[in-house]
Structure formats: structure tokens, C-alpha cells
């Protein structure tokens, strides 16, 4: 039940990005929303041989990936900040998961170019906003209210049976032709039913 | 200002052992690859070893593997080359280097080892 | 592993005039748009001094005088103007893989 309400409410996150808004804003699609998380796709040029890559969420560093090389060409790459990462031949990417209203805002890719030289930073960005469509929001409003109610409604009723049941019980030990009666109105109504048979 | 100073050098029978430090300064140690280059008295320059940032990755040459073991200590911001079943031809001014991105740009003052009976 | 060779062994050049030292790789060191050759510089008594890095870049502080060049397996380093604090040996050095290996060296002095 719980794993279908959370798919559920992943299903209901949308994604807006809004880029050009910042200075050194991405000119390509930054977000890529997928699988109820988002891709951050971080591009540096091919000819980079060396450099740090960090997301940055506002001015807090997220996640980071280092690639350099040794003196016999060996690559080595190295996260401080784990994410889930993928580094291809001119992009990083950073894979968010899990998201809620919390993980909405300017995300940037903060490159030190160590190779080639000179050294470099160039900061790229955009705005993530996530919001919720309004038939998901009103179907989150009343969910919980239409479930509590129905809980109230069963209490109730609960109360309900235990009190009427309690009541004629009470009243059948209090009446000691209760049995009697009790019979008699069964065996009048097989006599009846004979009747009908006959006719 | 980078520093980079070796010491454990010194006279060394054949089949013996030593272990060379050294120590940097000046520049963050743990963003960089380092290396061990060797020169044998009047001769050329030979690589020997390095060994990537974090110490997960480490190369030898053909010379001294399975002989030779580089480490670093981050925290210490100091290299080490441990030598070990030393030979004559080991002989030489062993030198620290840092790796700094495309080329040694950085070396120590250099430690002389002397491999001899 | 790559056999890096060197000529001439030793020059000896007048002040002011330019010096030429030719280096040459077994295989090819150009990966992409770059030549993994780096140009040291060793004086008497001194650790060895980066000078020029991918065959052509001069390092920070070199002087002008010092160019280099070439592509693929032949390299060139040259002094367009040597100067008295030029008397060194220099060495090639290719990074394209492991090893990584240095030229035999070539002496620069004055005439």
C-alpha cells in the first residue's frame, strides 16, 4: 500500500526547468526528468583532458567528480561528494533521486578546466522547479480527509453494533418469556409458509 | 611556494633495503599524482613509479616492479618508496616529482642511494 | 614500451645563436588534437625543469627563446637565442603511456 501511494505521488511531480534566467545559463537541456528523478547533464568541451566537475545547489556543493591523468596516461576519477554519476567524452551527468519540493533551485556546474591549460572555471546553470499538477494536488488534499473520515465512519459504526448488540442482550435476560416468544413467532411463521405451499 | 624534500637515503648492501620519503609542502598534496625518477651518477633520467591522488592506483617500471612498492599518507602530505632485494644498478639520486597534470613540474633537491657491498 | 632517441648527443653553440635538438619516439604520441612530449631542462647539480609540455606549450616562466615542435614521432626544441644560463642537458620525454620514458639526453654548451 505504501510503495503505491509513493509511485503515485512520483507520478504526480512535474518538472519545469527555466534556463536563460542566470548569468552563464546552460544552452542545452540540463534537466532530463526520468524514473521519478532527474538527470543534471553537465558538458564540458571534448578537448578537456583534466578536470573537476561540481553540482552545485545554490551555493551548496552537492556532488563532484575529478578526472585526471598520471604520467603514464592512466585515468583516474575520483568523487568527494558520491552520486550517482556517468561521465561520457564531453558531459557529466549527476542522477537526483527521490524528489519532493525541497530540491527545487538554481542548480549550477561549477568546471575547473586543469587540462589543457590555462586553468579555467566556467559555472553553467538553471532553475529547477517542481511543482505538482492540480488534479494530483486536490486528490492529495482530500485523499488523507476522505480516509479519515472513512476511519470516523467505522469507529462509528463499531460503536454502533457493540451498543445495540449490548441492548438486546440486556433486554433478552431481563424478560423471561423472551425465549418463549421468541419461538412461537418462528413456528407461526412455518405454519404460514405451509399455507401459502398448499394454496 | 611548492616544496618537495626527499630523505632515506644513504649506503645499502646488495639484497637490502630502504625506504625514501618524502615531504611536500605548498601546494594541496591530495589533488595530485606523484611520482619517483631516478639518475644514476653521470646518466640519464629513468622513470620509476607513481601513484595516482587517493593511492588506489599505482605503476612501476619494467626495472623495479615486484621490488619497489611507492605509497603516500595524505594526511602527512609525504610520499614513499619502499625498496626492497636492492641491486648495484639501483645506484642513482632518486628524485620526487609531482605530476602536474601534463609534465613534472615540480621537483625535490633529490636523495642519493648507493647500492654496494 | 616507447624508445625515445635524441640527437645530437652534444652541441656546442656560440652565445646568441640558435640551437636545435631533434627528438624521435618509436610509436606516435599524438592522441586526439595532442602530443604527449614534454621538453626538460637540467643544469649541473640541479633536479631537471619542465619547459615545454604537449611538444609546442611553453611551461609558466620559460623564457620566449624556447619553442618546440613537431607532431607525431619527430620533435624539435629549439633556442632561438641561447643565452649563458642555457647550459644544460635537455630531455625529451613522452607521457602517451606506461612507462612513460625520457630520451638519453642531449648537452648544450657554449662555443
Known amino acids: 500500500m505504501k510503495s503505491g501511494l509513493w509511485y503515485f505521488f512520483l507520478f504526480c511531480l512535474r518538472i519545469k526547468v527555466l534556463t536563460g534566467e542566470i548569468n552563464g545559463s546552460a544552452n542545452y537541456e540540463m534537466f532530463i526528468f526520468h524514473n521519478g528523478g532527474v538527470q543534471i547533464l553537465c558538458k564540458y568541451p571534448d578537448i578537456v583532458q583534466q578536470f573537476k566537475m561540481q553540482l552545485l545547489k545554490g551555493g551548496q556543493i552537492l556532488c563532484d567528480l575529478t578526472k585526471t591523468k598520471g604520467s603514464g596516461n592512466t585515468v583516474s576519477i575520483k568523487s568527494l561528494k558520491f552520486c550517482h554519476s556517468q561521465l561520457s567524452n564531453n558531459s557529466v551527468s549527476f542522477f537526483l533521486y527521490n524528489l519532493d519540493h525541497s530540491h527545487a533551485n538554481y542548480y549550477f556546474c561549477n568546471l575547473s578546466i586543469f587540462d589543457p591549460p590555462p586553468f579555467k572555471v566556467t559555472l553553467t546553470g538553471g532553475y529547477l522547479h517542481i511543482y505538482e499538477s492540480q488534479l494530483c494536488c486536490q486528490l492529495k488534499f482530500w485523499l488523507p480527509i476522505g480516509c479519515a473520515a472513512f476511519v470516523v465512519v467505522c469507529i462509528l459504526g463499531c460503536i454502533l453494533i457493540c451498543w445495540l448488540t449490548k441492548k438486546k442482550y440486556s433486554s433478552s435476560v431481563h424478560d423471561p418469556n423472551g425465549e418463549y416468544m421468541f419461538m412461537r413467532a418462528v413456528n407461526t411463521a412455518k405454519k404460514s409458509r405451509l399455507t401459502d405451499v398448499t394454496l | 611556494e611548492v616544496q618537495l624534500v626527499e630523505s632515506g637515503g644513504g649506503l645499502v648492501q646488495p639484497g637490502g633495503s630502504l625506504r625514501l620519503s618524502c615531504a611536500a609542502s605548498?601546494?594541496?598534496?591530495?589533488?595530485?599524482?606523484m611520482d619517483w625518477v631516478r639518475q644514476a651518477p653521470g646518466k640519464g633520467l629513468v622513470w620509476v613509479s607513481n601513484i595516482d591522488e587517493s593511492g588506489s592506483i599505482t605503476e612501476y617500471s619494467p626495472f623495479v616492479k615486484g621490488r619497489f612498492t611507492i605509497s603516500r599518507d595524505n594526511a602527512k602530505n609525504t610520499l614513499y618508496l619502499q625498496m626492497n632485494s636492492l641491486r648495484a644498478e639501483d645506484t642513482a639520486v632518486y628524485y620526487c616529482t609531482r605530476w602536474g597534470r601534463f609534465g613534472f613540474d615540480s621537483w625535490g633537491q633529490g636523495t642519493l642511494v648507493t647500492v654496494s657491498s | 614500451d616507447i624508445v625515445m632517441t635524441q640527437s645530437p648527443d652534444s652541441l656546442a653553440v656560440s652565445l646568441g645563436e640558435r640551437a636545435t635538438i631533434n627528438c624521435k619516439s618509436s610509436q606516435s604520441l599524438l592522441s586526439g588534437s595532442f602530443n604527449y612530449l614534454t621538453w626538460y631542462q637540467q643544469k649541473p647539480g640541479q633536479p631537471p625543469k619542465l619547459l615545454i609540455f604537449?611538444?609546442?606549450t611553453r611551461h609558466t616562466g620559460v623564457p620566449d627563446r624556447f619553442s618546440g615542435s613537431g607532431s607525431g614521432t619527430d620533435f624539435t626544441l629549439t633556442i632561438s637565442s641561447l643565452q649563458a644560463e642555457d647550459v644544460a642537458v635537455y630531455y625529451c620525454?613522452?607521457?602517451?603511456?606506461?612507462?612513460?620514458?625520457f630520451g638519453p639526453g642531449t648537452k648544450v654548451d657554449i662555443k
Open positions: 620525454h613522452h607521457h602517451y603511456n606506461a612507462p612513460p620514458t
Open positions: 605548498g601546494f594541496t598534496f591530495s589533488d595530485y599524482w
Open positions: 604537449y611538444a609546442s
